[in-house]
């Protein structure tokens, strides 16, 4: 019988008492085969973290700063359940740390030196740790003691709780630096008042502070937010303009064997019986003998943290950067305007080899990072382990939902000013063998299908979106008799046709021979009835253009396209017989790397792009013998996006809507994790 006990860690006598009450009340409402609580008392949160890591306890609720400590080796804990605030309909699990300024003040984030600053309090998250952590490498040296460096950075400050004797500049705007509400500039509202009164130029608070202090929109319109990309935005656009997104209070557990499902089962049942307004005798979110015991008194309930989410992803790149800077205190030798090497994310060993060759030819401009799947790469770019990669539109959507931005688009048509003219897109098509003359778009049920990969545009999102509209369910593996859709569950019929050996079977990378455009077409040639690819795939792999044994004798005339009206057309008539127009593949990166990725890639394509005529003797960025490694092989150049610089603008309303509709069928664990951070 599996042990269904969750050992909760308590950090004080009062918490231990509440924990025992929690345990007893849960016993009274949960059947004997359900989850139960045991209480473990430790002297501090750090002791609780260590106890969980050592398997002496299972769970504890932590503030964001401690979630970071819990994640660090050797603890390796992960977030499993989040407290939420507000309503069940609009649950808030995060708050945003923001920098508020007056509208007419005219400076940006990178111009804060010499300004006057208002802080909620020394050592507090939104008011100190996050802004000072992010500004850390701009502070004058020596950076220790930190208070002295901050005092020398700003021309005056109010940082309540600072030592006014040692660091008078930190108390210049609020004499005495009182550490309670007796100081009119203490806390969130106090820091905002410090700005409002004209004492300071910038206030470091949380996103709700301005709404709580100014009910009137006209008053709020006198203020703006400073964004990390050195722009400003209105105060209600805090989701797109903040210093960090911070989880409020989170239950953590071991990453391996951490009982996360059991902890959720326990807390979900606990909130049903003892949540807000549920029971008089025991209340989960109330602390009669103290404040915020076990859980925050202001919490309204719990939400399960998606399993794909580790602490780095949960805390977010900005928060982790800020806290790491403060803790480790390391900065580059001397900040320069030089761009650091771009860390390109390569999928599996084929792409890694091409990336390594690019890296040595780039003379230090490109470094390589490997991952096994596109989603793993996106996650690495999110957390700073990698910087950029080129993605199919379906993954541009996921990357966008995860906070990444498109920076350059692949262009596939030769033109005079290729780099200045991003194209409208390519065509997603359904290809069949000419010999299967009875096959049409209307009778695909029970046939064998070949897809580039799950989540990709031409191979999945477009055809499956159209199919979903017809069949109104997500069981595509029942619609087709079998197929190869790399990235499907291994036991699915949509992995049955795949050719990868062993663990590589149906993997969404080049170790699976039927992966990607060329792979899906090969699947059709060798085993399938229909392949969902791009309009250039057939000509690129027939007529001797692909020298591989399976392709060298193929003839374009032996294949036809399925049109949505139930007819068929020759392959060259794709403009009048396609499933939809697909946005071109695009390079994505984090917002903070956008300028450098843009600059370095434009240099790289001038050196190694399609102007290189002899790819047998020189490195060519856009060539890999039909394997589409790092970039599509038919890329002519990487083009500027002009104003299409967000994922929504880049992909276009129609495509975003189509993928959004297909979201209910999504098996993307990364998309689930990212929409948890930003619903």
């Amino acid at each position: 019988v599996p042990d269904k006990t969750v050992r909760w860690c308590a950090v004080s006598e009062h918490e231990a008492t509440k924990c025992q009450s929690f345990r007893d009340h849960m016993k009274s409402v949960i059947p004997s085969d359900g989850p139960s609580v045991a209480c473990v008392k430790k002297a501090s949160y750090l002791d609780c973290i260590r106890a969980i890591a050592a398997n002496e306890a299972d769970a504890v609720t932590l503030d964001a700063g401690l979630v970071y400590d819990a994640y660090l080796a050797p603890n390796n804990l992960k977030p499993v359940v989040a407290e939420f605030y507000g309503s069940k309909e609009d649950p808030q699990t995060f708050y945003y740390a923001v920098a508020v300024v007056k509208k007419d003040s005219g400076f940006q984030m990178n111009q804060l030196r010499g300004k006057k600053s208002c802080h909620t309090g020394l050592g507090r998250s939104a008011g100190w740790n996050i802004p000072i952590g992010l500004l850390y490498c701009d502070l004058p040296e020596p950076r220790k003691p930190l208070e002295k460096a901050v005092a020398n950075f700003f021309s005056g400050s109010c940082a309540p709780c600072a030592d006014g004797t040692d660091f008078p500049q930190l108390c210049q705007l609020c004499p005495g630096c009182g550490c309670s509400t007796l100081n009119q500039y203490f806390g969130y509202s106090g820091a905002f008042k410090c700005l409002k009164d004209g004492a300071g130029d910038v206030a470091f608070v949380k996103h709700s502070t301005i709404f709580e202090n100014l009910a009137n929109k006209a008053d709020r319109d006198q203020y703006e937010l400073l964004c990390l990309d050195n722009t400003r935005k209105p105060v209600d656009e805090y989701k797109d303009c903040h210093l960090a997104q911070v989880p409020s209070h989170t239950v953590v557990a071991r990453s391996m064997g951490g009982k996360e499902d059991l902890i959720w089962e326990l807390l979900n049942q606990a909130q049903e019986h003892f949540g807000k307004d549920k029971s008089k005798e025991f209340q989960l979110f109330s602390s009669p003998h103290g404040k915020d015991l076990l859980f925050k008194d202001s919490a309204h309930g719990f939400l399960k943290v998606p399993p794909r989410m580790d602490a780095k992803m949960y805390l977010g790149y900005e928060y982790v950067t800020a806290i790491r800077n403060l803790r480790e205190g390391t900065c580059p030798e001397a900040p320069t305007d030089e761009c650091k090497p771009v860390k390109w994310c390569a999928l599996s060993h084929h792409e890694r080899l091409k990336c390594d060759e690019w890296s040595v030819n780039s003379v230090g401009k490109i470094e390589c990072v490997s991952a096994e799947t596109t989603e793993d790469c996106i996650a690495k770019i999110m957390n700073g382990e990698a910087d950029a990669m080129s993605l199919d539109g379906g993954f541009v959507y996921i990357a966008g939902k995860c906070g990444l931005v498109p920076v350059l688009a692949e262009n596939y048509n030769k033109s005079d000013n290729c780099e200045d003219t991003p194209e409208a897109g390519y065509f997603a098509i359904a290809v069949v063998k000419k010999s299967a003359s009875d096959l049409t778009w209307d009778n695909l049920k029970g046939k064998k299908s070949c897809h580039t990969a799950v989540g990709r545009t031409a191979g999945w999102n477009i055809p499956m979106g159209l199919l979903y509209n017809k069949i109104n369910h997500c069981r595509f593996d029942e619609f087709f008799s079998e197929g190869c859709a790399p990235g499907s569950k291994k036991d699915s019929s949509l992995c049955k046709l795949c050719m990868g050996s062993g663990l590589n079977l149906c993997e969404p990378n080049n170790k699976e021979g039927y992966y990607g455009y060329t792979g899906a077409f090969r699947c059709l040639v060798e085993k399938g009835d229909v392949a969902f690819v791009k309009h250039q795939t057939v000509p690129q792999n027939t007529g001797g253009k692909n020298p591989d044994p399976w392709a060298k004798n193929l003839n374009e005339k032996d294949y036809e396209l399925l049109c949505l009206d139930g007819t068929r057309k020759p392959v060259e008539e794709y403009a009048n017989c396609h499933l939809a127009r697909a946005p071109n593949h695009a390079v994505v990166t984090r917002k903070d790397k956008e300028a450098c990725v843009h600059k370095i890639l434009r240099q790289q394509q001038h050196l190694f792009g399609s102007n290189v005529t002899d790819c047998s003797g020189n490195f060519c960025l856009f060539r890999s013998e039909t394997k589409d490694l790092l970039f599509r092989d038919d890329t002519v150049c990487l083009a500027k996006l002009h104003d299409r610089n967000t994922y929504e603008k880049y992909l276009g309303e129609e495509y975003v809507k189509a993928v959004g509709n297909l979201r209910k069928c999504s098996t993307s664990s990364l998309l689930e994790a990212c929409t948890f951070r930003r619903p």
Epitope: H350, E351, L353, K354, D356, E357, V360, N361, V363, D614, C615, S616, G617, N618, F619, S624, E625, K627, L629
Partner: nanobody
Framework: QVQLVESGGGLVQPGGSLRLSCVAS????????MGWYRQAPGKQRELVAA???????KYTDSVKGRFTISRDNAKNTVYLQMNSLKPEDTAVYYC???????????WGQGTQVTVSS
């Protein structure tokens, strides 16, 4: 088809040196970048060093300052001089011609390097 033949491996004590050679034969006039990779038991194959036809080089962090890659275009040969060897350098070392390897999974047979006292 390019043939790559590696040699020069062997058993050496920590702190010792070895020089690996890789000779390319076949249609080698067009080889641009050459690289040395290594694979230890149970580990992924990893880049050790690479060199372009013009002599640009790249090294993995763990071998910087100890290993030197060079090439002799006239002899169609790439070398890896390995000094101050450590036990963690133990692996099979492969040389690769990038212009083919990433499409055709083509590798030579490799040469075993063992660093042990």
């Amino acid at each position: 088809q390019v043939q790559l033949v590696e040699s020069g491996g062997g058993l050496v004590q920590p702190g010792g040196s070895l020089r690996l050679s890789c000779v390319a034969s076949g249609s080698i006039f067009s080889i641009n970048t050459m690289g040395w990779y290594r694979q230890a038991p149970g580990k992924q194959r990893e880049l050790v060093a690479a060199i372009t036809r013009g002599g640009n080089t790249k090294y993995t962090d763990s071998v910087k300052g100890r290993f030197t890659i060079s090439r002799d275009n006239a002899k169609n040969t790439v070398y890896l001089q390995m000094n101050s060897l450590k036990p963690e350098d133990t692996a099979v070392y492969y040389c690769t011609d990038y212009s083919r390897s990433y499409y055709q999974d083509y590798w030579g047979q490799g040469t075993q390097v063992t660093v042990s006292s």
